[in-house]
Interface confidence: medium
């Protein structure tokens, strides 16, 4: 997250970290069910661990943390690397979470976002770009949903209805390492960090997010079929 600020503790209990060995974060994710996460399909790696209820980036033990394995990874069937359409994936945890103030699911919004909606994006991704500098704790940033027209103008022939753009002033954006993390609008999960320009936070080059309102049926059916 570029030019965000430290999230208040306990305010993002659905935020998950996907870790490679040993405790190396490579993507964010979102708890949407007691045993299921959503993340970006481009975050797919099969050998990973899942950390929930953790505030700092470092692997130091925190009393609220819960650790899991991802036993199933189910990318949306319409996703195809290196494209950006349908960039979402469900991950089944090896057991159900223990609900606490630090670990709690969030509902996926069935309403598509309208331009101007204020949202919050969070993650442990780099706080500088193109340099890489990772934060000590979870970062939060207020962003606003842009109209689809402005989104398409920013990225001609690259935007479809499975994506939406959001940003703020130049210099504020999600970035590498935030992928798969949540965009929360009006208390519901609206999007996942998907892609954008490089370096991050360039003027008139907003972040692009997976438009989850288009996928509520697939999410529900996939969870039911694999539970």
């Amino acid at each position: 997250i570029i030019n965000g600020s430290d999230c208040d503790m306990h305010t993002q209990p659905w935020q998950a970290a996907l870790l490679l060995r040993p405790n190396q974060l490579y993507c964010g994710a979102v708890l949407v069910h007691p045993q299921w996460l959503l993340t970006a399909a481009h975050c797919r790696k099969k050998v990973f661990r899942v950390r929930l209820g953790h505030y700092s980036l470092s692997p130091v033990y925190e009393s609220g943390q819960q650790m899991f394995q991802g036993v199933k990874s189910i990318p949306h069937p319409g996703y195809s690397h290196p494209g950006h359409s349908n960039d979402l994936m469900l991950i089944k945890l090896n057991r159900r979470i223990r609900p606490t103030k630090d670990v709690r699911p969030i509902n996926v919004s069935s309403h598509c976002p309208s331009a101007g909606t204020k949202c919050l994006v969070s993650g442990w991704g780099t706080t500088k770009s193109p340099q890489v500098h990772f934060p000590k704790v979870l970062q939060c940033l207020n962003i606003s949903v842009l109209s689809q027209k402005r989104c398409e103008d920013a990225y001609p022939r690259q935007i479809d209805d499975t994506m939406f753009c959001a940003g703020d002033k130049a210099g504020r954006d999600s970035c590498q390492g935030d992928s798969g993390g949540p965009v929360v609008c009006n208390g519901s999960l609206q999007g996942l960090v998907s892609w954008g320009d490089y370096p991050c936070a360039r003027p008139n080059r907003p972040g692009v997010y997976t438009n989850l309102c288009k996928f509520t049926k697939w999410i529900q059916e996939t969870i039911q079929a694999n539970s």
């Epitope: 060995r21 040993p22 797919r44 099969k46 050998v47 661990r49 394995q69 991802g70 199933k72």
Partner: antibody, heavy 122, light 110 residues
Framework: QEQLEESGGGLVKPGASLTLTCTVS????????????MCWVRQAPGKGLEWIAS???????TDYASWATGRFTISKASSTTVTLQVTSLTAADTATYFC?????????????WGPGTLVTVS | AIEMTQTPSSASEPVGGTVTIKCQAS??????LSWYQQKPGQPPKLLIY???DLASGVSSRFKGSGSGTQFTLIISDVECADAATYYC????????????FGGGTEVVVK
């Protein structure tokens, strides 16, 4: 029921190369959804277990023990076979070679093993 | 490089006794430690993963504990069928590893 079986062992001469094959049944290495790794472990006669290499069949990413890099190659040959190629064999490579699977549900600990295949370098 | 040191190398215990095996990692491996049992002529069998979680079908007489660098396997109420060699294994990292397994502990039941 998940089963693994190694083949390709036997008596080989020093300096030779060898390909060991692990054939799986009851599951597929190209399962798109279930997360697991496959590995090779060896055990010299009367000695302890020695991890050689692991492969993630989902993205074919591999890990090797530091001593195995270069001379050993693990790969997914098909939806039912994982191979281990060994070059420049020496007497120190004489061992029973085991193929194993580690599931995400057991933190990738090796919860399924084959019976092993004996390689004798002489 | 993470190295695993297992003690003792052998242990002898009468039926009904308790065996304690220790495993030390050269650096912290969190809780990513497994224990295996191997009998002569057989492949290893997973007993415990994540330091203390019992694998499917394993007797509750086997108890794992520890985190960081110090781990323990306790076999209580030992039976003749427990005679085997026991190995610990770290799965915290697979980079720059000489061997992820400990050297083994042979358990003899008298």
């Amino acid at each position: 029921q998940e089963q693994l079986e190694e083949s390709g062992g036997g008596l080989v001469k020093p300096g030779a190369s060898l390909t060991l094959t692990c054939t799986v049944s009851g599951f597929s290495l190209t399962n798109n959804y279930v997360n697991f790794v496959m590995c090779w472990v060896r055990q010299a006669p009367g000695k302890g277990l020695e991890w050689i290499a692991s492969i993630d069949p989902g993205d074919d990413s591999t890990d090797y023990a530091s001593w195995a890099t270069g001379r050993f190659t693990i790969s997914k040959a098909s939806s039912t076979t994982v191979t281990l190629q060994v070059t420049s064999l020496t007497a120190a490579d004489t061992a029973t070679y085991f193929c194993a699977r580690g599931d995400a549900g057991t933190s990738y600990s090796f919860n399924f093993w084959g019976p092993g295949t004996l390689v004798t370098v002489s | 490089a993470i190295e695993m040191t297992q003690t003792p190398s052998s242990a002898s215990e009468p039926v009904g006794g308790t065996v304690t095996i220790k495993c030390q990692a050269s650096e912290s491996i969190s809780r990513y430690l497994s224990w295996y049992q191997q009998k002569p002529g057989q492949p290893p069998k997973l007993l415990i993963y994540d330091a203390s979680d019992l694998a499917s079908g394993v007797s509750s007489r086997f108890k794992g504990s520890g985190s960081g660098t110090q781990f323990t396997l306790i076999i209580s109420d030992v039976e003749c069928a427990d005679a085997a060699t026991y190995y610990c294994q770290q799965d915290y990292s697979r980079s720059n590893i000489v061997n992820s397994f400990g050297g083994g502990t042979e358990v003899v039941v008298k």
